[in-house]
């Protein structure tokens, strides 16, 4: 991963505009505050992806954390992101604000902990009391991340001087627990299945040597109990799991699981749920639209991509003019299918450098032994406009004719536009257009065909002037939607020799 | 009171496979685990393997290609698979019982000698 | 995997007199939720499987005479045996119960003169 600037650390102006890039050889994404902040994402054509983070009206509360990390992580080091902290020094925001939980710190061992008090300015000085206390106690302070120490348990508050004013944070608590609290985790193999499949579910708890596992399910309602199993995990001390598994899962075994722990010692109590669904059958769906006719740029590198939801996991195929696609070794197409949540998925046909022979019709089928789905759609293939052919003639009527010729794809507009003064036109003088309402005496005549073969439509058109009294620069413009193309040519008086 | 007895053949020849069975008793293996130690000749012990109250497996890393663990609760048995025997396999082998949370082995059983040789 | 190393290897002592052996883990086996040390030691006596004596560093099996005392934290552990009778003739070994997987030690050799 590479971030512009570096950092890691830097200092910005309030109400200043900052921009951030940060860019990978895998889709990258700049995280604040654990939130994806918007941002521009990009991909190159070397291959290299790109997110650039614009930070607009920048105030003491931008002050922070800001991290790249790659979008998804799967295939490569999990653990690779780039941290950046930004201060923005505000003389309007004393302390930055905490959560409530950031406020009450509970301890069950004695080790160093943080008291997260922050500033927007690295340069204030800023010391740690006891709530009740003047004193500054010799606590090292990191403008990052607070004071960090072994603290008794007592509340504190940190203090700094902002201009000529004494500014206070809110008040830190510090609890020191003697057992530790519960805290639990419950898992499902599944949280999907078809009925006659088994729902097992699985609640953790860590560091009670002691606990009593309650599950409530919707078959314990109807009084049909399922015994669970508790499993003493060997990896670490006090690493306890319950273990419910209910065979032949029926329709009304769907609905909520609740796993509840306590200990007795102290009574303390923790509980977390998990909803399984119970189907009668697999399903295959498609999730959002996709268009009937879709665009790649000639020579570009385009993704079609189709986002479902199967259970259980479907076999993708994809199809173009009713024949099998598969990745060619070539490089030239790319099909990946990605499992995102336990029952979305992402399918993506990529076409690399698309050819014009590459349009045509396309399907994506997705199905498995319950239900399939298939999308479709035709891909045309744009074609930036290119002047063939401008030509002047001089047919015995007397009129002189300018003759262009282009092609792209989609179809091209056409347009004509002229200039008398060859000096000073076209940088100071706009060129005039012309056509069959221009006060010019010309007319037009303009044909188009489609070339099934080239998949793009040629546009010939003939300029008729008629009469030419001075030189003149005559201008042919192609123009479509990914491009246009530009030629002149100056047309002389018949009775100018050339 | 609690129990565990080791059984197996004494004798196996090199590539063979060795399977041993531990029988407890005084105890649930739905409690608690069930571990395999062996003492080499020359006096030192080595963790095999174990399967824990639920019936999770463990395995030595640099033996695990070699290991089966399994267990039939309704007869109170613990069964150790290991493969493609070597001469180094040679020890003393002896199953645990593994005291839930806390994870030390709180009785052992009389072990069983197994000797590899051609 | 946690590595435990033993000394020494093997002590003569007169009945009576009081042996320490030490235990070093390559990780501090001290656990953090209730700041106990997962450290066992065993005794094996000839001929015998071996037998538990301590766990959890200090806390003695139940029959386990008081003269054997488990002490330590973090990485380094002793085994003292305050007055060493006849019968403590045997091999000892620590063990990280910490969790998988279990390394044991490579023993010390009590030899009484």
């Known amino acids: 991963l590479v971030v512009t600037p570096p950092g890691p650390e830097l200092v910005l102006n309030v109400s200043s505009t900052f921009v951030l890039t940060c860019s990978g050889s895998a889709p990258v994404v700049w995280e604040r505050m654990s939130q994806e902040p918007p941002q521009e994402m990009a991909k190159a054509q070397d291959g290299t992806f790109s997110s650039v983070l614009t930070l607009t009206n920048l105030t003491g509360l931008d002050t922070g954390e800001y991290f790249c990390t790659h979008n998804d992580s799967r295939g490569l080091e999990t653990d690779e992101r780039k941290r950046l902290y930004i201060f923005v020094p505000d003389p309007t925001v004393g302390f930055l604000p905490n959560d409530a939980e950031e406020l009450f710190i509970f301890l069950t061992e004695i080790t160093e902990i943080t008291i997260p008090c922050r500033v927007t300015d690295p340069q204030l000085v800023v010391t740690l009391h006891e709530k009740k206390g003047d004193v500054a106690l010799p606590v090292p302070y990191d403008h990052q991340r607070g004071f960090s120490g072994i603290f008794e348990d007592r509340s504190y508050i940190c203090k700094t001087t902002i201009g000529d004013r004494e500014v206070d944070s809110d008040a830190y608590y510090v609890y020191r627990l003697q057992v530790s609290s519960i805290n639990v985790s419950v898992n499902a193999v599944q949280t999907v299945v078809r009925q006659g499949e088994n729902i097992t579910l699985m609640c953790i708890v860590i560091g009670n040597e002691v606990v009593n596992f309650e599950w409530t399910y919707p078959r314990k309602e109807s009084g049909r109990l399922v015994e669970p199993v508790t499993d003493f995990l060997l990896d670490m001390p006090y690493h306890i799991r319950s273990i419910l598994h209910i065979p032949s899962a029926e329709l009304e075994d769907s609905g909520t699981y609740t796993c509840n722990v306590t200990e007795s010692v102290n009574d303390h109590q923790d509980e977390k749920a998990i909803n399984i669904t119970v189907v009668e059958s697999g399903y295959v769906r498609l999730l959002g639209e996709v268009g009937t006719l879709q665009f790649a740029e000639l020579h570009r590198s385009r993704t079609l991509q189709v986002v479902f939801e199967a259970y259980p996991p479907p076999t993708v195929l994809w199809f173009k003019d009713n024949r099998t696609l598969g990745d060619s070794s070539a490089g030239e197409i790319a099909l990946s299918t990605r499992n995102v949540s336990e029952t979305r998925y992402v399918s993506e046909l990529t076409l690399v450098r698309v050819k014009v022979a590459e349009a045509g019709h396309y399907t994506m089928r997705a199905f498995h032994e319950d239900a399939e789905v298939q999308l479709s759609f035709q891909l045309q293939i744009n074609v930036p406009v290119r002047v063939l052919e401008l030509s002047e003639s001089h047919p015995d009527s007397g009129e002189q004719t300018v003759r262009c010729r282009g092609r792209g794809m989609p179809q091209p507009n056409i347009i004509w536009s002229a200039c008398r003064d060859l000096k000073r036109c076209p940088r100071e003088l706009p060129p005039t257009l012309l056509g069959n309402s221009s006060e010019e005496e010309s007319q037009l005549e303009t044909n188009v065909t489609y070339w099934e073969e080239e998949q793009e439509f040629e546009v010939v058109s003939t300029l008729r002037l008629q009469h030419v009294d001075r030189p003149l620069s005559v201008r042919c413009t192609l123009r479509n939607a990914v491009g246009q193309d530009t030629q002149e040519v100056i047309v002389v008086p018949h009775s100018l020799p050339f | 009171q609690v129990q565990l007895k080791e059984s197996g053949p004494g004798l196996m020849q090199p590539s063979q496979t060795l399977s041993l069975t531990c029988t407890v008793s005084g105890f649930s293996l739905t409690n608690y685990g069930v571990s395999w130690v062996r003492q080499f000749p020359g006096k030192g012990l080595e963790w095999i393997a174990a399967i824990s109250s639920g019936g999770s497996t463990y395995y030595n890393s640099a033996l695990k290609s070699r290991l089966s663990i399994s267990r039939d609760t309704s007869r109170s048995q613990v069964f150790l698979k290991m493969n493609s025997l070597l001469t180094e396999d040679t020890a003393f082998y002896f199953c645990?019982?593994?005291?839930?949370?806390?994870?030390?082995?709180?009785?052992w059983g009389p072990g069983v000698m197994v000797t590899v040789s051609s | 995997d946690i590595v435990m190393t033993q000394t020494p290897s093997s002590q003569a002592v007169s009945a009576g007199e009081k042996v320490t052996m030490s235990c070093k883990s390559s990780q501090s086996l001290l656990y953090g939720g209730d700041q106990k040390n997962f450290l066992a030691w065993y005794q094996q006596k000839p001929g015998q499987s071996p037998k538990l004596l301590i766990y959890?560093?200090?806390t003695r099996e139940s029959g386990v005479p008081d003269r054997f005392i488990g002490s330590g934290s973090g990485t380094d552990f002793t085994l003292t045996i305050s007055s060493v009778q006849a019968e403590d003739l045997a091999d000892y070994y620590c063990q990280q119960h910490y969790g998988y997987p279990f390394t044991f030690g490579s023993g010390t050799k009590l030899e009484i003169k």
């Open positions: 645990t019982r593994v005291y839930y949370g806390s994870n030390y082995f709180d009785y």
């Open positions: 959890l560093a200090s």
